[in-house]
C-alpha cells in the first residue's frame, strides 16, 4: 500500500548500555475527531476511549505493523521478520535495545473499510542511540520499585538528571493508557498499592531549528514489600529424631520460609555429619513450593535410597540462610522397634 499519506512521527530511544531495557511504539492512529485521515464512526468527546494514544481503530488490537527497509525494498511484516519485536494489541514491544532497531515502523488497521481508510496509517521514524551523556551518572533506572503502603515516585529515566523546574512537559502512559493528569518528569505516588505496578512510558518533545521529535523511555515498575528483617525459619522437619526402618528408602524434606528480599539469594541445603567428617548433599536441587508477595517457601529433600546402620550414627542437618542470617535443624535417625 502507498505510505506517502501516512501521518509521520519521529521518536528517539536513548538506551543505557549498563542495563537491560525495553521500548514500545504505540499505534498512534489519528483521532477521528481531529483528523481527516481516518473516516469511520465519529466519537463525541464523551465517548473518547480510555486509551487515548491509539484511537483511530474501533478494534484497537486489529492493527498491522510493518518495517520499511532502508534500501527501498517492500514493507516487511514485523511478526515474520523480527523475533525480538513483539506485537501486543496495538503496541510494539522491543525486547532488546540496540541501534539496529532504528528505522521506520508503519501501522495501519487490518480491516480497510472504505477507500479513505487507505491513508489511515502512521509512520514512526525511530532513532536508537546508546547513551553518551556521562555527566548524569545516576539517571533513573528502567526498572523501579515502589514500596507498598509508603510514598514513592516514578522517574522518567531520560529526564531524571534535570530539576523539576528545567523539565519539559512530559506525557505519561501506564500499560498503554494516557495518564492525563501527570505532566512532570516524576510521578509522585502518595500511597503505593499493588495496582501501581506496570509498564510506564514517558514522552517529551525535543526540537531543533529543523524538526521536532518525541524522546521516549519505558519504565517497568514493580510494587514490593520491604526487605525482611528476619532470618529464614525452618517449617519442617520439626522433630530432631525420626523413626525409620532399616533397608527401606527414606526422603526427609526440609521446608523453609524466606521473607522477601529485593536481592534474593536463598540457601537451603542438607549436609551430613559423621563423627569428625562432614559433607554436603548436592542433589536433588531446591524448589519453590509457594510464593507470595511477602515470602517464599522453599523445599529441599534429602533422599536415602536405603537406610543403613551407619545412617543411624549420622546427623542429617538442614541449613537455611538469607542475607540476615542462618538457621539449622538436625535430624537423628532412630530404628523403628516392633
Amino acid at each position: 500500500f502507498n505510505i506517502s499519506g501516512c501521518s509521520t512521527k519521529k521518536l528517539l530511544w536513548t538506551y543505557s548500555t549498563r542495563s537491560e531495557e525495553e521500548f514500545v511504539l504505540f499505534c498512534d492512529l489519528p483521532e477521528p475527531q481531529k483528523s481527516h485521515f481516518c473516516h469511520r464512526n465519529r466519537l463525541s468527546p464523551k465517548q473518547v476511549p480510555e486509551h487515548l494514544p491509539f484511537m483511530g481503530s474501533n478494534d484497537l488490537s486489529d492493527v498491522q505493523w510493518y518495517q520499511q527497509p532502508s534500501n527501498g525494498d517492500p514493507l516487511e511484516d514485523i511478526r515474520k521478520s523480527y523475533p525480538h519485536i513483539i506485537q501486543d494489541k496495538c503496541t510494539l514491544h522491543f525486547l532488546t535495545p540496540g541501534v539496529n532497531n532504528s528505522g521506520s515502523y508503519i501501522c495501519r488497521p487490518k480491516m480497510i473499510k472504505s477507500p479513505y481508510d487507505v491513508a489511515c496509517c502512521v509512520k514512526m521514524i525511530l532513532e536508537v542511540k546508546p547513551q553518551t551523556n556521562a555527566s548524569c551518572e545516576y539517571s533513573a533506572s528502567h526498572k523501579q520499585d515502589l514500596l507498598l503502603g509508603s510514598t514513592g515516585s516514578i522517574s522518567c529515566p531520560s529526564l531524571s538528571c534535570q530539576s523539576d523546574a528545567q523539565s519539559p512537559a512530559v506525557t505519561w502512559y501506564k500499560n498503554g493508557k494516557l495518564l492525563s493528569v501527570e505532566r512532570s518528569n516524576r510521578i509522585v505516588v502518595d500511597e503505593v498499592y499493588d495496582y501501581h505496578q506496570g509498564t510506564y512510558v514517558c514522552d517529551y518533545t525535543q526540537s531543533d531549528t529543523v524538526s521536532s521529535w518525541t524522546v521516549r523511555a519505558v519504565v517497568q515498575v514493580r510494587t514490593i514489600v520491604g526487605d525482611t528483617k528476619l532470618k529464614p525459619d525452618i517449617l519442617d522437619p520439626v522433630e530432631d529424631t525420626l523413626e525409620v526402618e532399616l533397608g527401606k528408602p527414606l526422603t526427609i524434606s526440609c521446608k523453609a520460609r524466606f521473607g522477601f528480599e529485593r536481592v534474593f539469594n536463598p540457601v537451603i541445603k542438607w549436609y551430613i555429619k559423621d563423627s569428625d567428617l562432614e559433607w554436603e548433599v548436592s542433589v536433588p536441587e531446591a524448589k519453590s513450593i509457594k510464593s507470595t508477595l511477602k515470602d517464599e517457601i522453599i523445599e529441599r529433600n534429602i533422599i536415602l535410597e536405603k537406610v543403613t546402620q551407619r545412617d543411624l550414627r549420622r546427623k542429617f542437618v538442614c541449613f537455611v540462610q538469607n542475607s540476615i542470617g542462618n538457621t539449622t535443624q538436625s535430624v537423628q535417625l532412630k530404628e523403628k522397634r516392633g
Epitope: E278, E285, A286, I303, Q321, N326
Partner: antibody, heavy 115, light 110 residues
Framework: SLEESGGRLVTPGTPLTLTCTVS????????MGWVRQAPGKGLQYIGI?????STYYASWAKGRFTISKTSTTVNLKMTSLTTEDTATYFC?????????????WGPGTLVTVSL | AYDMTQTPASVEVAVGGTVTIKCQAS??????LAWYQQKSGQPPKLLIY???TLASGVPSRFKGSGSGTEFTLTISDLECADAATYYC????????????FGGGTEVVLK
C-alpha cells in the same frame, strides 16, 4: 582406584559409551560423577549418579548423556556427538552418597569427534 | 544458576611468595565450595571442600575462606610443585546447572 576406558576417535553423530572401572570403592555408599575437559580448556561438570542410583545432569547434558552403574562400573552413554564433545572424560568419586565434591579421580579417557 | 567466576585467569608469582585466587558465585551457595589443583596431563586433585576444610594429605599452606558468594584460595610459601591450574567448584547443586566449575587460574612460578 578408578579407570576410564572406551575413549576413541568417532565421527559426528556416532553414539559412544565410556566405562569407569572401580576397585576398592563401594558404589552403594558413594556418589560417582563424570567431568570432562576439552583440550586446553577448563573442567566441565556432566552429571552424577548417587549411591542409590538416582541420576542428575548439567542442564546442557540432559537428554544426550546417560549415566548408569553396575556393582563395579559406572557408564556414560553419549549420543548425537559433535566436534564440541571432543575432550578428556574423567570419572570421579563423591565425598558422600549424594555429594559432588570429587575426592578420587580416574586418569581420564580421550574422546575425539572429527569428520 | 550457580555460575562460578574465577579471577585471575593467570598469575605469575615468585617461589616463596603468596598467591590469592578468588571465586565468585552468581547466587549464594553458603560454604558449598571445593578447590582443585590440576597439573598438565593429570586429573584434578581435591585440595579443599566446604570452603575451608583441607582434604586429606593437603599441606596447611593451602587455605580456603569465604561464604555466600565470595570465596578465596590462598597459597603461601609457594613451592615449584605448586605450579598448576586451580579450579573452584560449587557443590551446592548437582542438577540443572550449566557448569559447576570456575574457569580456572593458572599459577606460574618465576
Amino acid at each position: 582406584s578408578l579407570e576410564e576406558s572406551g575413549g576413541r576417535l568417532v565421527t559426528p553423530g556416532t553414539p559412544l559409551t565410556l566405562t569407569c572401572t572401580v576397585s576398592g570403592i563401594d558404589l552403594s555408599s558413594y556418589a560417582m560423577g563424570w567431568v570432562r575437559q576439552a583440550p586446553g580448556k577448563g573442567l566441565q561438570y556432566i552429571g552424577i549418579i548417587t549411591y542409590g542410583g538416582s541420576t542428575y545432569y548439567a542442564s546442557w547434558a540432559k537428554g544426550r548423556f546417560t549415566i548408569s552403574k553396575t556393582s563395579t562400573t559406572v557408564n556414560l552413554k553419549m549420543t548425537s556427538l559433535t566436534t564440541e564433545d571432543t575432550a578428556t572424560y574423567f570419572c570421579a568419586r563423591g565425598l558422600g552418597g549424594a555429594s559432588t565434591t570429587w575426592d578420587i579421580w580416574g586418569p581420564g579417557t580421550l574422546v575425539t569427534v572429527s569428520l | 544458576a550457580y555460575d562460578m567466576t574465577q579471577t585471575p585467569a593467570s598469575v605469575e608469582v615468585a617461589v616463596g611468595g603468596t598467591v590469592t585466587i578468588k571465586c565468585q558465585a552468581s547466587e549464594s551457595i553458603s560454604v558449598n565450595l571445593a578447590w582443585y589443583q590440576q597439573k598438565s596431563g593429570q586429573p584434578p586433585k581435591l585440595l579443599i571442600y566446604l570452603a575451608s576444610t583441607l582434604a586429606s594429605g593437603v599441606p596447611s599452606r593451602f587455605k580456603g575462606s569465604g561464604s555466600g558468594t565470595e570465596f578465596t584460595l590462598t597459597i603461601s610459601d609457594l613451592e615449584c610443585a605448586d605450579a598448576a591450574t586451580y579450579y573452584c567448584q560449587q557443590t551446592y547443586s548437582g542438577s540443572n546447572v550449566e557448569n559447576s566449575f570456575g574457569g580456572g587460574t593458572e599459577v606460574v612460578l618465576k
